[in-house]
Structures are given as structure tokens and as C-alpha cells.
């Protein structure tokens, strides 16, 4: 289809190169359409367009993004060619930064339904480049903790070392919606709740002489409760002792409930007591089975290939640890009669 | 009298396949005792190449170099083989199987006298 | 993978002499380690398993010591069956099976 009519949107990503962070880009079509398609409203309710031109599925997935390659060739389908774009709804969702994400990206709806419609797309001409000098040694992070039940703040991380009042008018996204009442580079939230959990976009303009465009940046805020006050505590092996079958194999399993740490490096492991030997054993990665807002439950187990004799004299000892302290739990195998 | 024999060995050309079977006499595989192959090549030491847990014969192990190349499988339950691959001269070895302890542990109590498996054009 | 290293290579001692030979382990693997002796002509056979236990039917002249990476077989009172090479093994079965041999040490005796 013919480019040319899109209207066309530049936008700067300036990503750094200590974090990991995302980018994301709107199916941003012109306004009355985008009221209807997208459902990312700028309109009041009671301000309904005069006309509709593009009378486009409700659908928010019906949007269809390509990549237009530098050299002239026919535009890329985005799903088939980079797996590291991913499209959700009218978003488009870069999982990693780097120079190579530099181009245009061009979203029109995929039901074409009037003549008008033809003309119904944008094209977003995107530069991407790495956070040049640590010219703000403290700007925010791309992911940003709010505490439950306390006051807190998002700050806009290209924007960050910034005075309030230098700041341009900044608009703000919360997954994907616009948050209207929001233009400074900070979002002030005087009591955090779960629901402030979310995908955060800030926009501000930048202009020069040539043109101007528009610098974004991607926050993932998350709402986290206080850290732990408690040690982690075993939930499994409860017995300190289990019947076994000799050379038959056996697994063990060790389950702890670690408290909510912001920064977590939780600890098990398995190791092995023979009299007055110790040795930690080498088992399978530990996985985590359950994760709420207040803890999380990681199991790792031991697996004897066959259960000996020897087996039989030894201790097989859990070891859980936090930030905070240490829990170990024993079990002892002892052969199944009859 | 609790016995181990391994057969099947021979000249074999490089690039050939060959497998060995190793017969258990005075005594059935059960599932504590795990049967397993040793080569030692003319002149040097033994290197382990595969075991295989004796009852069901599901379980099986080997050593990082041999997989690929090489499969145990429990035949009978008097009989596992040793299917081996695109051979090369370094295979050239004595093949030896062996029986495990079984609830005792891991170590290697009763042998087979090998069986020689030559790899030349 | 572990790696098991044997020292010496090859020792000489006369008969009613001790021989100590040693066998190092690339990581800790507990008690978990075995000792052979191989004729020539012969399959192995084993002398000791989980470090320090006697096999069946093997003289007390042999004793075996040692955990964690660092394993010692001793012979004393020395004879002239003694005349073999001598392997060390780590066999380990917890999540995974792991079987590794030493390259050997040669006894002779005097």
C-alpha cells in the first residue's frame, strides 16, 4: 500500500546502557480515528467528533505494523522478521534496546473498510541511540518501586535531573491509556495502591531549528510491599525422617517460603552429612512455585539416583537464607520394612 | 556362581557399527543393581562409557564423550548391549561390562573378563 | 564433569613396604570414590568403595582414607600379589550420575 499519504510521527529513544529497559510504540492514527479504533481516547465522552472517516473494527488487535527496511525493499511484516518486537494490541513492545531498532514503523488498521480508510495509518520514524556522557549520574530508573500504602512518585527518566520548572510539558501513558491531568516529568501518587502497578510511557517535544520530535521513555513500575523481617522457613520436608526403599530412586523435596526483599538473592541448596563430612551437592536449578506480593515459595530438590546403604548413615540437610538469616532442615533415611 | 561375559567384539572398519551384548549367568538384573561399560584402550587406563539401571532398564547414563554415539539398553533380563557408531581407531579398546554393588552403592563388584574391539582399514 | 588425578604414576617398594597412592578430585564429591586393582590380562577388581570401605573378601593390608577432593588407598605389609595398577573412581548418583577413573598408578614390588 502507498506510504505517502501517513502521517508521520519522529521519535527519539535514548536508552542506557546499564539497564535493561523497553520501548514501546502506539498505533498513534490521526485523531477522530484513533478515538474509535483504539481506544485511547483524548476526547472527553461528551466531545464526540463531527465525523468518523475511518469506521474501524473495535477489535485492538486489528492493527497491522511493518517495518519499512532503509534500502527501498517492499515493507516487513514486524511478527515475521524481529522476534524481538512484539505486538499487543495498538502497542508495539521493543524487548531490547540497541541502535538496530533505528528505523520506520508503519501501523494501519488491517480491515480496510471505506475509501477513506486507505489513507488511515502512520508511519513512526524512530531513532534509537545510547545514553551518551553520565551527564545525570542519578537519573531514574526504567523500573521503579512504589511501597504500598505510602506516598511515592514515577519520575520520567529522560527527564529526571530536571527542575520542575525547567521541565517541558511532559504527557504521560499508563498502559497504553493517556493520563490527562499528568504534564510535569513527575507523577506524585499520594497513597499507592496495586492498581499503580503498571507500564508507565513519557513523552516530552524536542525541537531544533530543522524539526522537532519526540523523546519517550518506558517505565515499569511495580508496587511492592515492605522488606522482611523474617529469615525464610521451610514448608517441606516437615518429618526429619523418611522410609525409603533401598536401590530404588528417590526424590526430595525442599519448599521455603522467602519474604518480599527488594533487592532478593534467595539461597537453597542441598547438602550432604556423612559423620563428620559435609558436602553440598550439585541438584537441579531451584524454581519458584508460587509468588505473591508478600513472599514467594521456591522449591529445589535433591534426587538420588538410587538410594544405598550408605545413604542410609547419611544426613540430607536443606539450607534456606535470606538478607536476614538462615533455616536448615534435616532428613535422615530410614528402609521401608516388609 | 554369579558371572559376566562380554561378546561381540572383532575388527570393525572405521566409520562402522558394532554392538556388544553382555550376558549375566547365576543371577537376573534387578532394579538396585545397575549394569555398566568400562573400555580401557591397549596400553592405558579405564574410561568409563555407560550404565543402565537393571530393572526397568529405563534409566540410563553416560559419560558426556559417549552420548551420540553410543546406547545401552537391556535386552533381556540376562542381557544388555552396547550399540556403538561411526567408530574411529581411538575406539580401539578392551570393552568391559560390570555390575554395581546395588543397595551398597556405585562401585564396580563383579567384571567380565572384555571383550577386544579393533578399529582399523 | 569431575576430573580424577592420580599420583604417582608409578611407585616401587620392596616386599613387608607401604605404598600410598593418591587420588585428587576435580570438585567435592563426599566419600563417593572406589579403588581398584588391575592385573594384567585381567578385569579390574575392587578393593574399596565409599572411601574407606572394604570390598568383600579383600585383605585389612588395604585401607583407604579421605573426603571432599583429596583420597588416599595405603597397602602395607606389601607381597608380591601387591604387583598391579591401581585405580581410583568417583561414582556419584545424586541428581545425575557421575563416573570418572584415575589414570592409574603402577605398583611394583621389590
Known amino acids: 500500500f502507498n506510504i505517502s499519504g501517513c502521517s508521520t510521527k519522529k521519535l527519539l529513544w535514548t536508552y542506557s546502557t546499564r539497564s535493561e529497559e523497553e520501548f514501546v510504540l502506539f498505533c498513534d492514527l490521526p485523531e477522530p480515528q484513533k478515538s474509535h479504533f483504539c481506544h485511547r481516547n483524548r476526547l472527553s465522552p461528551k466531545q464526540v467528533p463531527e465525523h468518523l472517516p475511518f469506521m474501524g473494527s473495535n477489535d485492538l488487535s486489528d492493527v497491522q505494523w511493518y517495518q519499512q527496511p532503509s534500502n527501498g525493499d517492499p515493507l516487513e511484516d514486524i511478527r515475521k522478521s524481529y522476534p524481538h518486537i512484539i505486538q499487543d494490541k495498538c502497542t508495539l513492545h521493543f524487548l531490547t534496546p540497541g541502535v538496530n531498532n533505528s528505523g520506520s514503523y508503519i501501523c494501519r488498521p488491517k480491515m480496510i473498510k471505506s475509501p477513506y480508510d486507505v489513507a488511515c495509518c502512520v508511519k513512526m520514524i524512530l531513532e534509537v541511540k545510547p545514553q551518551t556522557n553520565a551527564s545525570c549520574e542519578y537519573s531514574a530508573s526504567h523500573k521503579q518501586d512504589l511501597l504500598l500504602g505510602s506516598t511515592g512518585s514515577i519520575s520520567c527518566p529522560s527527564l529526571s535531573c530536571q527542575s520542575d520548572a525547567q521541565s517541558p510539558a511532559v504527557t504521560w501513558y499508563k498502559n497504553g491509556k493517556l493520563l490527562s491531568v499528568e504534564r510535569s516529568n513527575r507523577i506524585v501518587v499520594d497513597e499507592v495502591y496495586d492498581y499503580h502497578q503498571g507500564t508507565y510511557v513519557c513523552d516530552y517535544t524536542q525541537s531544533d531549528t530543522v524539526s522537532s520530535w519526540t523523546v519517550r521513555a518506558v517505565v515499569q513500575v511495580r508496587t511492592i510491599v515492605g522488606d522482611t523481617k523474617l529469615k525464610p522457613d521451610i514448608l517441606d520436608p516437615v518429618e526429619d525422617t523418611l522410609e525409603v526403599e533401598l536401590g530404588k530412586p528417590l526424590t526430595i523435596s525442599c519448599k521455603a517460603r522467602f519474604g518480599f526483599e527488594r533487592v532478593f538473592n534467595p539461597v537453597i541448596k542441598w547438602y550432604i552429612k556423612d559423620s563428620d563430612l559435609e558436602w553440598e551437592v550439585s541438584v537441579p536449578e531451584a524454581k519458584s512455585i508460587k509468588s505473591t506480593l508478600k513472599d514467594e515459595i521456591i522449591e529445589r530438590n535433591i534426587i538420588l539416583e538410587k538410594v544405598t546403604q550408605r545413604d542410609l548413615r547419611r544426613k540430607f540437610v536443606c539450607f534456606v537464607q535470606n538478607s536476614i538469616g538462615n533455616t536448615t532442615q534435616s532428613v535422615q533415611l530410614k528402609e521401608k520394612r516388609g | 556362581q554369579e558371572e559376566l561375559v562380554e561378546s561381540g567384539g572383532g575388527l570393525v572398519q572405521p566409520e562402522g557399527s558394532l554392538t556388544l551384548t553382555c550376558t549375566a549367568s547365576g543371577f537376573s538384573f534387578s532394579s538396585s543393581y545397575w549394569i555398566c561399560w568400562v573400555r580401557q584402550a591397549p596400553g592405558k587406563g579405564l574410561e568409563w562409557i555407560a550404565c543402565i539401571v537393571g530393572g526397568g532398564g529405563v534409566n540410563t547414563y553416560y559419560a558426556n564423550w559417549a552420548k551420540g554415539r553410543f546406547t545401552i539398553s537391556k535386552t533381556s533380563s540376562t542381557t544388555v548391549t552396547l550399540e556403538m557408531t561411526s567408530l574411529t581407531v581411538a575406539d580401539t579398546a578392551t570393552y568391559f561390562c560390570a555390575r554395581d554393588l546395588g543397595a551398597d552403592g556405585y562401585a564396580y563388584h563383579l567384571w567380565g573378563p572384555g571383550t577386544l574391539v579393533t578399529v582399523s582399514s | 564433569d569431575v576430573v580424577m588425578t592420580q599420583t604417582p604414576a608409578s611407585v616401587s617398594e620392596p616386599v613387608g613396604g607401604t605404598v600410598t597412592i593418591k587420588c585428587q578430585a576435580s570438585?567435592?564429591?563426599?566419600?563417593?570414590l572406589a579403588w581398584y586393582q588391575q592385573k594384567p590380562g585381567q578385569p579390574p577388581k575392587l578393593l574399596m568403595y565409599d572411601a574407606s570401605d572394604l570390598a568383600s573378601r579383600v585383605p585389612s593390608r588395604f585401607s583407604g582414607s579421605g573426603s571432599g577432593t583429596e583420597f588416599t588407598l595405603t597397602i602395607s605389609d606389601l607381597e608380591c600379589a601387591d604387583a598391579a595398577t591401581y585405580y581410583c573412581?568417583?561414582?556419584?548418583?545424586?541428581?545425575?550420575?557421575?563416573?570418572?577413573f584415575g589414570g592409574g598408578t603402577e605398583v611394583v614390588v621389590k
Open positions: 573412581q568417583c561414582t556419584y548418583g545424586y541428581s545425575g550420575y557421575v563416573s570418572a
Open positions: 570438585q567435592n564429591i563426599g566419600n563417593n
